[in-house]
Amino acid sequence: QFELEILSMQNVNGELQNGNCCGGARNPGDRKCTRDECDTYFKVCLKEYQSRVTAGGPCSFGSGSTPVIGGNTFNLKASRGNDRNRIVLPFSFAWPRSYTLLVEAWDSSNDTVQPDSIIEKASHSGMINPSRQWQTLKQNTGVAHFEYQIRVTCDDYYYGFGCNKFCRPRDDFFGHYACDQNGNKTCMEGWMGPECNRAICRQGCSPKHGSCKLPGDCRCQYGWQGLYCDKCIPHPGCVHGICNEPWQCLCETNWGGQLCDKDLNYCGTHQPCLNGGTCSNTGPDKYQCSCPEGYSGPNCEIAEHACLSDPCHNRGSCKETSLGFECECSPGWTGPTCSTNIDDCSPNNCSHGGTCQDLVNGFKCVCPPQWTGKTCQLDANECEAKPCVNAKSCKNLIASYYCDCLPGWMGQNCDININDCLGQCQNDASCRDLVNGYRCICPPGYAGDHCERDIDECASNPCLNGGHCQNEINRFQCLCPTGFSGNLCQLDIDYCEPNPCQNGAQCYNRASDYFCKCPEDYEGKNCSHLKDHCRTTPCEVIDSCTVAMASNDTPEGVRYISSNVCGPHGKCKSQSGGKFTCDCNKGFTGTYCHENINDCESNPCRNGGTCIDGVNSYKCICSDGWEGAYCETNINDCSQNPCHNGGTCRDLVNDFYCDCKNGWKGKTCHSRDSQCDEATCNNGGTCYDEGDAFKCMCPGGWEGTTCNIARNSSCLPNPCHNGGTCVVNGESFTCVCKEGWEGPICAQNTNDCSPHPCYNSGTCVDGDNWYRCECAPGFAGPDCR
């Protein structure tokens, strides 16, 4: 909707546009209107943009009016929430951004016979984007002055410059999203797609064989399994097999059959043939044993002569019997095949906790260190093994020994260094234990056997320029005299770094201070205050462009200050009656010389060249293949002699043509076989060999025999706003903006208020390549000086 709010009205005399009084008669004496005030109300008409506004015609975007909201003069700026002074024009179409607005102030006659009369009317054509911010407009000419504000706001869920982009947040089957400030859908966590209705599956879930209805899930398609649905399910019952696709059963080595359950190498897997029989695989799960002499049976398990196989182990002798065989065992062995060692450790004969080890037909005692002998019954001499490490002597005792330790050592073997560190080291020093002694390792700044002494770091007089040295732990500090700094007072302080002087004043460094030499108009320690010239010297108005003031800077004792109303491109010329005109520099025009004259108006650039306006000058950016100040010269593309093998060159626009001889082909007569190579067509064009010629198929934005000429299409229609010049750049374009405009398509108004041209707290109003200063009370002039 388009909203307009009346802010104030000033109709000092209570007059109508036609000069009559709202309330009837004038006072014959002072010619002021008498009787009652105007009964003011407003009418609004909103229509399509008109560069030359016409009062008639339909209000195609809507119209409306307020009730009577005041008399001659009123101010409604403070009355927020009062809808009487507001007109709302809803629109059900895309907002076109540009518009023309007619606002009329009317006097209500309050009777049916007399028609209402118009007080004042304002028209405004412009461009406004939807925003919550109000834009204030003023009508400052004619009998009445009034101020109003306008804005365009989009309905809920509508966005964009045209309020025609719809976005309503939702979290249901059809989508899971919020809307950003531009009306774009922003998917909730776990959702994706243009409508945010596609769940993002578990990270790693196979995009081919897995899917999900809920974010984070991973459901496998039929025939697939595993954490990420990337493992196929083999055929049910598949034993020694794998799959690459679902329901396969691809057998591992040595397995066969439909379910890979048939052993093709039964011999290797089971080794069924005994007694040296040779195994042969005869089929899946089948084998045959060929037995050595004296053995038979499917696995060669039957011995035809029982003693042939040497069944009696450990030198036992074999005797064949009716039941097979019988073994007679050698000493220390027992069992049917003499394979069991008789336990000679039962009972245990080892004394003093010795461990008995069974041998064949005997035993051995493993004695504890203090005992020796066949059954550990003898006392061992432990001193023979030299167990004492740091000792004067070793004494053998029964089942033990004694070491007489050297000073500083202890423990059974005198191998433990006695810790002599008992807190003797001071000032957090660490103690290193030595043999029968210790050493203190001092932290920085301390010395002495026990680190009890603080080292004096000031002893070497490190402070310069009369600095006083203060000793601290492991460091010193220099207290510097005035004018010096640095850890050793080695730096002479430069009070001018950084420069404290403002408004271009020169800074002078002193021993302990600085001095600012202020320019004429400034004063104060840092030259930060504007001199109030009128406090000391009265100003004399010479004419509407100049004032004079007393000054000791000039020989005459008078300084003339010129007005800068004509800006940087003009000089002020005084006229009679307090008026002035601006004498513009070459290349500029307009009331305040703020408009750069368009030197391109005469279209001086030829052959498709683009004209860029300068100050009292212009520059031609030539189309490909042209040069010269006016793009009047066709560049000679034959100058580099591009035609090989005797070919004759003919210059074209941004191109050349080679007339080839003796069967040579191609763009430069370089080939015997083909008309095309990678350099034939420019700018990404595709080359086709057509026998005796070549043809280039050009990408968008390019044309010509070798795609060498940029089409103007990227500049048609002109994408550059506000009088900007479009320069073709292949498939793209560049805008050269007029003064006062910037941005890729010259759509942004340059901030002419930067940097702060208005003095003395004046407020700057930015226009299109101009600014205006609204001065604080007590100040005047174009820049409130």
Epitope: I200, C201, Q203, G216, D217, G226, Y228, D230
Partner: antibody
């Protein structure tokens, strides 16, 4: 800030059923996360038991599959673990942990754990 | 099951010195999406494990930059550039490429 808190009896008889509950705060168990149980026998390493998603999709460690059930109570925002035919080998600290389905970090939040002893 | 093998099983390091733990898997942990699903956790005494590194080399939020991970396929390393007292505990690697998820036996880090 998501928080997980395990609770349940600290002592279970052999051949009985071990039952634990994990209460989640700061996140919904119906979010895009998987919720796992992991256990750690005293002085030993970590063993993954199984996981559940939205109360309907479960995966279990094959070594425990025949004895384990993981379920959810959406109204209480809780995950439960049931382990039948408990033996002394099931004595461990049991942790519940969040395992994001979306995002690269796995097992990014854990409960403090609860010790369960299987003994008569 | 994929077997994760860590070396060494214990480590004693002086504060300020570097430390390195190796983890080998019995199968490649490289997924078809190009990511490698190997994770490192630290379990401080009396606490649950906490995530340090995800997908081989990415530090989880709040993890100091002295921790770094590297490796590919089946061989991975966790490095601590300068060990601090608060780094003591048991470090575990874990694979997330296949069921069941499996952890290494753990490496106990102590301060000398």
């Amino acid at each position: 800030q998501v928080q997980l808190q395990e609770s349940g009896p600290g002592l279970v008889k052999p051949s009985g059923t071990l039952s634990l509950t994990c209460t989640v705060s700061g996140d919904s168990i119906s979010s895009s996360n998987w919720w796992s149980w992991v256990r750690q026998p005293p002085g030993q390493g970590l063993e993954w038991i199984g996981e559940i998603f939205h109360g309907e999709n479960t995966n279990y460690n094959p070594s425990l599959k025949s004895r384990v059930t993981i379920s959810v109570d959406k109204s209480k925002n809780q995950i439960s673990l049931n382990l039948t035919s408990a033996t002394a080998a099931d004595t461990a600290v049991y942790y519940c942990a969040r395992n994001p389905g979306i995002g690269a970090a796995k097992f990014d939040s854990w409960g403090q754990g609860t010790l369960v002893t299987v003994s008569s | 099951d994929i077997v994760m093998t860590q070396t060494p099983l214990s480590l004693s390091v002086t504060p300020g010195q570097p430390a390195s733990i190796s983890c080998k898997s019995s199968q490649s942990l490289l997924h078809s999406d190009g990511k490698t699903y190997l994770y490192w956790y630290l379990q401080k005494p009396g606490q649950p494990p906490q995530l340090l590194i995800y997908e081989v080399s990415n530090r989880f939020s709040g993890v100091p930059d002295r921790f770094s991970g590297s490796g590919s396929g089946t061989d991975f390393t966790l490095k601590i550039s300068r060990v601090e007292a608060e780094d003591v505990g048991v470090y575990y690697c874990m694979q997330h490429i296949d069921f069941p998820f499996t952890f290494g036996q753990g490496t106990k880090l102590e301060i000398k």
